[in-house]
């Protein structure tokens, strides 16, 4: 049941990326939606050896990752503002989970290149728009009402069955021929119906 609701929630969420609306907009798919979260892809040139990548939401630093090398060429990777991230030889992926409307915003990849020189900062970004489809909204509106109606019908059905059972029991106690009379009535009804058909 829980997993069903979770898949329904995933189905309801849609992510739309509006790129080209800002200077330095990403010329690649920056947002990848999966597993109820979003992977934000921040690319950098293959030649870059050492850098700092910051993920900005509006003007706020959400995540960062710094890659440097020591004098023995040993790599050090640090995060001051930790997010689940993944480093490849030309990109850093930051993962955001449990998406809701508050996540809709401009997201920027702020790349500071240390090596090779000269020191350079580049900013690329796009708009992450989270919306719910009309069908989904209708479903979300009618589903609880439908469930409530079903529960009410079930309760009423139970009450009715209980009431009928109780009535039947009480009538059979007062009239010993009650059951015989009931059977006769049913049989008569059957006969008349058959007559109707032959005519």
């Amino acid at each position: 049941m829980k997993s069903g609701l979770w898949y329904f929630f995933l189905f309801c969420l849609r992510i739309k990326v509006l790129t080209g609306e800002i200077n330095g907009s990403a010329n690649y798919e920056m947002f990848i939606f999966h597993n109820g979260g979003v992977q934000i892809l921040c690319k950098y040139p293959d030649i870059v050896q050492q850098f700092k990548m910051q993920l900005l939401k509006g003007g706020q630093i959400l995540c960062d990752l710094t890659k440097t090398k020591g004098s023995g060429n040993t790599v050090s990777i640090k995060s001051l503002k930790f997010c689940h991230s993944q480093l490849s030889n030309n990109s850093v992926s930051f993962f955001l989970y449990n998406l809701d409307h508050s996540h809709a915003n401009y997201y920027f990849c702020n790349l500071s290149i240390f090596d090779p020189p000269p020191f350079k900062v580049t900013l690329t970004g796009g708009y992450l728009h989270i919306y719910e489809s009309q069908l989904c909204c209708q479903l979300k509106f009618w589903l609880p009402i439908g469930c409530a109606a079903f529960v009410v019908v079930c309760i009423l059905g139970c009450i009715l069955i209980c009431w009928l059972t109780k009535k039947k029991y009480s009538s059979s106690v007062h009239d010993p021929n009650g059951e015989y009379m009931f059977m006769r009535a049913v049989n008569t009804a059957k006969k008349s119906r058959l007559t109707d058909v032959t005519l």
Epitope: Q49, Q50, T68, G70, S71, G72, N73, S76, D115, P116
Partner: antibody, heavy 117, light 111 residues
Framework: EVQLVESGGGLVQPGGSLRLSCAAS????????MDWVRQAPGKGLVWVSN????????EYSPFVKGRFTISRDNAKNTLYLQMNSLRAEDTAVYYC??????????WGQGTLVTVSS | DIVMTQSPDSLAVSLGERATINCKSS??????????LTWYQQKPGQPPKLLIF???TRHTGVPDRFSGSGSGTDFTLTISSLQAEDVAVYYC?????????FGPGTKVDIK
């Protein structure tokens, strides 16, 4: 302006210990790997040790491994070199250097360590 | 460990003349598009100073008479027109892996 100032050098007997310090200023100390490089009188440069930005990675020259310990205090902008079991061959000027991503771009004036009985 | 060798041990050049220093590594210093080799200048009584990194890129403020070349295992530092202030010992250094090592140095004097 980047400044590195070493201190703690001096005369010590073989088998003795010494702790060198390097006070850094003029840059964000916690953003850089730092190294110690030494130079025996009239000789060439020899790399001793390095440490990454937060002190989680340290590396040592085979000549000093197990005897020397590099550390840093980013709150105090200071680099340290703890030298134990000193030998005559450790006599040298010890330079504190900043690894500027692709080379030692800043050097202190050095502090002389003399190991002699 | 990678062993760095330099030649010559010393050289004397007339003012305004070209000085050439060679450096050889015991294994290739090329990784990707970078040669992990730097050159330092050490004047008497002073700490070393970074001149060239990645074999051929001049550090900030270094005069353009200094140039670096080479790839793999063979590298060269050239002073196109020697000036009096260039009297120093020049060291090549690799940072290809740990431990980084320096060459023995080449002393440059004025003839």
């Amino acid at each position: 302006e980047v400044q590195l100032v070493e201190s703690g050098g001096g005369l010590v007997q073989p088998g003795g210990s010494l702790r060198l310090s390097c006070a850094a200023s003029g840059f964000t100390f916690s953003d850089y790997w730092m190294d110690w490089v030494r130079q025996a009188p009239g000789k060439g440069l020899v790399w001793v040790s390095n440490i990454d930005e937060d002190g989680s990675i340290t590396e040592y020259s085979p000549f000093v491994k197990g005897r020397f310990t590099i550390s840093r205090d980013n709150a105090k902008n200071t680099l340290y070199l703890q030298m134990n079991s000193l030998r005559a061959e450790d006599t040298a000027v010890y330079y504190c250097t900043r690894w500027g991503r692709f080379g030692f771009d800043s050097w202190g004036q050095g502090t002389l360590v003399t190991v002699s009985s | 460990d990678i062993v760095m060798t330099q030649s010559p041990d010393s050289l004397a050049v007339s003012l305004g003349e070209r000085a050439t220093i060679n450096c050889k590594s015991s294994q290739s210093l090329l990784s990707g598009s970078f040669n992990y080799l730097t050159w330092y200048q050490q004047k008497p009584g002073q700490p070393p100073k970074l001149l060239i990194f990645y074999a051929s890129t001049r550090h900030t403020g270094v005069p353009d008479r200094f140039s670096g070349s080479g790839s793999g295992t063979d590298f060269t530092l050239t002073i196109s027109s020697l000036q009096a202030e260039d009297v120093a010992v020049y060291y090549c250094h690799h940072h290809y892996n740990a431990p980084p090592t320096f060459g023995p140095g080449t002393k440059v004097d004025i003839k």
